[in-house]
């Protein structure tokens, strides 16, 4: 069929923040490289119908469906979506190909469906069909990677059962401690599933997909390192694989390693050994202990012993269900206005938690740091000395945890005053919560020393700022004080602050604010 034009269908993914409905356009935005949708002739269809590969789009993503037509002469076109006709403006590119585009900004459920493009050229008419659906991210998962021994080889395979298929990488480091941070030059990354070099100091495997990145560290006991002051502890859930690596370096090959669970040697098939010579001709041996699917009775002390090094143990605890252990009692803090202070939560959890710090309905990123004793700690220092309620929330696959903190900032009261026809009110948010006095200013008392005790009502109330208390004092108007100046004073251990109010007619009439330290 010589008359058929050569057409190409492409998908362009955009990085944009505009908000609009689907529209036909000849002006694509900043974009990533086009993806060929391989338009193929649809067999057994009446007329000439090309069908593009199905397009899956994330919610809120922006895309362009584009058709490139290599046919002589002018073309005209029409887009049809859900029985509605959409305007179509073809243009020609530098290679003189006809270009027709449909831009979909901020993909929503209503924009999913079949997009039909009718093209009329001087030679022939044809239809192109695009099917656009929203990617079901509810089905997305990102699971922590785990290890398996490669069949008949001394190598580890890293597996992460995630959707979409994750990119798996090994993160290797041969230094100690801080220098093994992700950005460090000591860190080497290998984007592959199988790892043969298993002698390194620190070995992690990471999996990443659209949902983020999850890593698992190969639990290691190094017999040449001074043992931790607390026993290393490893938690696993029933059914998960257990991998512990024991590593030892000696001046020559004349030493051996063994693994024991409690007092009993691990059974054949639950360990394998590898050895190599290092650059300085010392011998490195590693002995892996592994259980492909742990049960409750795999709990216990796993001890790696050597004929030339002191033995070291790790406590492996198998749990039915994940957990988060921490004290959830609320904590109150009071600090000075310029005092350095951080909230902190110490917890033990398995699997690793995801967490947030929240203040005044705003969430802040949460960082966690592992401690030597098997606990982790999360600190929050970014409170900017704002008093109120702070919330730490943590969760993993099996558990949730919330802890409340109240931050009070010690400061001298600041007084705001307002008056109405029947009463005068003063407000203060100093901390500790202030006490109030009311004084009448008159000829007899020009310094406002005559105290008013009748008709005064004090209360504390919650203000809009989350969890922050404000104290108020209200003076009910009486004939005895109408027309006079009155002074309300708020005082606490850090000082006193006053406002003077004229009690004659409605409306706020605060005059002078006196700050008396």
């Amino acid at each position: 069929n010589q008359d058929l034009p050569v057409i190409k269908c492409v998908l362009i993914n955009h990085k944009n923040n505009d908000s609009s409905v689907g529209k036909s356009s000849s002006y694509p935005m900043v974009s990533e490289s086009p993806e060929d949708l391989g338009c193929a002739l649809r067999p057994q269809s009446s007329g000439t119908v090309y069908e593009a590969a199905a397009v899956e789009v994330d919610v809120s993503a922006s895309i362009t469906l584009q058709v490139l037509v290599d046919a002589p002469g002018n073309i005209s076109c029409l887009w049809v979506f859900k029985h509605s006709s959409l305007n179509c403006q073809p243009h020609f590119d530098l290679q003189n190909r006809g270009v027709v585009s449909m831009v979909i900004l901020k993909m929503t459920e209503t924009q999913a469906g079949e997009y039909l493009l009718f093209i009329q050229s001087e030679a022939t008419n044809y239809t192109i069909l695009f099917t656009v659906s929203i990617r079901n991210t509810l089905l997305y998962t990102l699971r922590r990677p785990y290890f398996r021994k490669m069949e008949n080889q001394d190598a580890l395979v890293c597996i992460s059962e995630s959707v979409p298929e994750p990119i798996v990488e090994w993160v290797l480091c041969d230094s100690q401690g801080e220098s093994c941070k992700e950005e460090s030059p000591a860190v080497v990354k290998k984007e592959e599933k199988v790892l043969h070099e298993l002698f390194g100091t620190d070995i992690r495997c990471c999996a990443r997909n659209e949902l983020g990145r999850e890593c698992t560290r190969l639990f290691t006991i190094d017999l040449n390192q001074t043992p931790q002051t607390t026993l290393p502890q490893l938690f696993l859930k029933v059914g998960e694989p257990l991998w512990i690596r024991c590593k030892a370096v000696h001046v020559n090959h004349g030493f051996g390693l063994t693994w024991e669970l409690e007092n009993k040697a691990l059974e054949e098939g639950n360990y394998f050994e590898m050895s190599t010579y290092s650059t300085n001709r010392t011998m490195i041996r590693i002995l892996f202990a592994f259980v492909s699917s742990v049960a409750r009775n795999d709990t216990g002390y796993y001890t790696c012993s050597s004929s030339k090094h002191p033995s070291q143990s790790a406590l492996v605890t198998i749990v039915e269900k994940g957990f988060i252990n921490a004290t959830n009692s609320s904590e109150d803090y009071e600090i000075d206005q310029y005092e350095e202070f951080c909230f902190s939560v110490r917890f033990k959890a398995y699997p690793q938690i995801r967490c947030t710090w929240t203040f005044s309905r705003k969430s802040f990123p949460c960082e966690q740091k592992g401690l030597d004793n098997g606990y982790s700690i999360s600190k929050f220092c970014n409170h900017k000395h704002q008093p109120g309620e702070y919330i730490f929330h943590a969760e993993n696959d099996d558990a949730q945890f919330t802890k409340m903190f109240t931050l009070n900032i010690r400061r001298k009261p600041q007084v705001l005053a307002e008056a109405s026809a029947s009463q005068a009110s003063c407000f203060s948010d100093g901390y500790p919560l202030p006490s109030w006095t009311w004084k009448k200013c008159s000829d007899k008392s020009p310094n406002c020393t005559e105290e008013i005790t009748e008709g005064v009502w004090n209360r504390k109330a919650n203000r809009k700022v989350f969890g922050q208390w404000v104290s108020s004092s209200t003076l009910n108007m009486s004939e005895a004080i109408k027309g006079f100046l009155v002074k309300c004073c708020a005082y606490n251990s850090l000082g006193t602050s006053c406002e003077t109010i004229l009690l004659n007619s409605p409306g706020p009439f605060p005059f002078i604010q006196d700050n008396i330290s």
Partner: antibody
Framework: EVQLVESGGGLVQPGGSLRLSCAAS????????MSWVRQAPGKGLEWVAS???????YYPDSVKGRFTISRDNSKNTLYLQMNSLRAEDTAVYYC??????????WGQGTLVTVSS | DIQMTQSPSSLSASVGDRVTITCKAS??????VAWYQQKPGKAPKLLIY???YRYTGVPSRFSGSGSGADFTFTISSLQPEDIATYYC?????????FGGGTKVEIK
């Protein structure tokens, strides 16, 4: 049923030697760490030596260089060779299964008396 | 070496009483602590391992708790057959060390 039976105890002069044996039954002897623990008359327990399934040996400083622990897996037997014995080595010597962590089974003990 | 300090060294209690023995390690030993019972003229018997786990066949009146450096052994309701000396032991590191023992008698 796990059974540990010690033998070889007796009276020995200071500076002398003695070899204790422990016959084990009722479990896979070769798979387990084994130990010797002693108890001086009227006193508490003191760990003396351990050997794990791989044959690696461990001693406290008080006996290092004088005592040697060994095992014969084909005979299901644990040994303690004691040389240069001193009066303070006088004790009941117990053979115990374990030592990598806890001691889960104990024999009835054999008395070693070091005296001139 | 890690020292295990047991207290009291002896105690006297009535049948049915709750008995508590403490053991203090000279450094953090995590939960790597065991408790043994030794009756007069007999070999010791393992009662509790990993600080709080009862060994097979041990009656439920015996329990253990603690982590770090402070450990407690409890007999919830003392029975006549519980007359014995009780020892704690750490297996956090070599050498394995025992407490000095607590002799439990019946009033």
């Amino acid at each position: 049923e796990v059974q540990l039976v010690e033998s070889g105890g007796g009276l020995v002069q200071p500076g002398g030697s003695l070899r204790l044996s422990c016959a084990a039954s009722g479990f896979t002897f070769s798979s387990y760490a084994m130990s010797w623990v002693r108890q001086a008359p009227g006193k508490g327990l003191e760990w003396v030596a351990s050997i794990n399934s791989g044959g690696f040996t461990y001693y406290p400083d008080s006996v290092k260089g004088r005592f040697t622990i060994s095992r014969d897996n084909s005979k299901n037997t644990l040994y303690l060779q004691m040389n240069s014995l001193r009066a303070e080595d006088t004790a009941v010597y117990y053979c115990a299964r374990g030592g990598t962590t806890v001691f889960d089974y104990w024999g009835q003990g054999t008395l070693v008396t070091v005296s001139s | 070496d890690i020292q295990m300090t047991q207290s009291p060294s002896s105690l006297s209690a009535s049948v049915g009483d709750r008995v508590t023995i403490t053991c203090k390690a000279s450094q953090d030993v995590s939960t790597a602590v065991a408790w043994y019972q030794q009756k007069p003229g007999k070999a010791p018997k393992l009662l509790i391992y990993s600080a709080s786990y009862r060994y097979t066949g041990v009656p439920s009146r015996f329990s253990g708790s603690g982590s770090g450096a402070d450990f407690t052994f409890t007999i919830s309701s003392l029975q006549p057959e519980d007359i014995a000396t009780y020892y704690c032991q750490q297996h956090f590191n070599t050498p394995r060390t025992f407490g000095g023992g607590t002799k439990v008698e019946i009033k």
